[in-house]
């Protein structure tokens, strides 16, 4: 049985151009301990978008709108969105370890695509 | 109706060994984050140990860190602690408690006695 | 560790009164713009039992007299209006970082 589920329910979103994308994730549990970061795109290449532990993302805003009792929301929401932003976002968990945290799940992505800025 | 009924509890003494268990019932005991948290009436409540639902993950503080092992019988609804090296400040009402989502304390157990004394 | 201070100590308040207790956290307990900040209630003799997860959700069951509030690093707990059966000891908890900690309590009884 699974010990914790990386839930991002959207498969993908439309954002128009200069407007706010809102991307969301939920986890089934806190365990194991570790940060969740997001990222865009996957591998090596991978761009980090969000880290609320170290980093500075002017950008990006958290947003936990729905509490649920046997979920924890770690979404988030990207300002002033740009053709440049789009691309694949995913949700990581990672476990704490020692020396470096290690991957532990991964959402299934939520692709973003930004239609034209409306005239 | 969620039960926890912890057992095992008793008197032993400095160094010596002891080990808890607390029996589920009333909810689907394999996808629960369990732990235990101690009480006395000097340091109040205090975290001792939290196990992953499936067993794998175990979280210790450092004043029972070497000492306690935490462990889960998912097929038998069960959950145990082991406590060595035993020591004074170790005697307190010992809970039994669940978490499902591995953040609050959902449900408690009534609760066993362990004092540590010569 | 993150340490947290619960205030008042003890609490007399008149039946059918706010009863306010207040819960610091020497660092925020806040990720993702959740809190993880709980409160529990103890009466004598019995386990804790959970009464509002991570800051200002009411546990099911819980009487709605019962709120929570705060983010960050301070939290408080009213009970509005007080109840007899409101008689006990109420603890916070933050599960934010390992170690998790409790507050040292705040005993309530009627004035």
């Known amino acids: 049985e699974d010990e914790l589920q990386v839930i991002q329910p959207e498969k993908s979103v439309s954002v128009a151009a200069g407007e706010s994308a809102t991307l969301r994730c939920a986890m089934t549990s806190l365990i194991p301990v570790g940060p969740i970061m997001w990222f865009r795109g996957a591998g090596a290449g991978r761009e980090l978008i969000y880290n609320q532990k170290e980093g500075h993302f002017p950008r990006v805003t958290t947003v936990s709108e729905l509490t649920k009792r046997n979920n924890l929301d770690f979404s988030i929401s990207i300002s002033n969105i740009t053709p440049a932003d789009a691309g694949t976002y995913y949700c990581v968990k990672f476990r704490k370890g020692s020396p470096d945290d290690v991957e532990f799940k991964s959402g299934a992505g939520t692709e973003l695509s930004v239609r034209a800025k409306p005239s | 109706e969620v039960q926890l009924v912890e057992s095992g509890g008793g008197l032993v003494k400095p160094g010596g060994s002891l080990r808890l268990s607390c029996a589920a019932s009333g909810f689907t005991f394999s996808s629960y984050v369990m732990s235990w948290v101690r009480q006395t009436p000097g340091k109040g409540l205090e975290w001792v140990a939290t196990?992953?639902?499936?067993?794998?993950?175990?979280y210790y503080p450092e004043s029972v860190k070497g000492r306690f092992t935490l462990s889960r019988d998912n097929a038998k609804n069960s959950l145990y602690l082991q406590m060595n090296s035993l020591r004074a400040e170790d005697t307190a009402v010992y809970y039994c408690?669940?978490?499902?989502?591995?953040?609050?304390?959902?449900?408690w157990g009534q609760g066993t006695t362990v004092t540590v004394s010569s | 560790d993150i340490v947290m201070t619960q205030s008042p100590a003890s609490l007399a308040v008149s039946l059918g009164e706010r009863a306010t207790i207040s819960c610091r956290a020497s660092?925020?307990?806040?990720?993702?713009?959740?809190?993880?900040m709980h409160w529990y209630q103890q009466k004598p003799g019995q386990p804790p039992k959970l009464l509002i997860y991570?800051?200002?959700n009411l546990e099911s069951g819980v009487p709605d007299r019962f709120s929570g509030s705060g983010s960050r690093t301070d939290f408080t707990l009213t009970i509005n209006p007080l109840q007899a059966e409101d008689v006990a000891t109420y603890y916070c908890h933050q599960s934010a970082d390992l170690p998790w900690t409790f507050g040292g309590g705040t005993k309530v009884e009627i004035k």
């Open positions: 196990i992953s639902s499936g067993g794998t993950y175990t």
């Open positions: 660092e925020s307990v806040d990720s993702y713009g959740n809190s993880f």
């Open positions: 408690a669940s978490q499902l989502t591995g953040s609050e304390f959902d449900y």
């Open positions: 991570r800051a200002s």
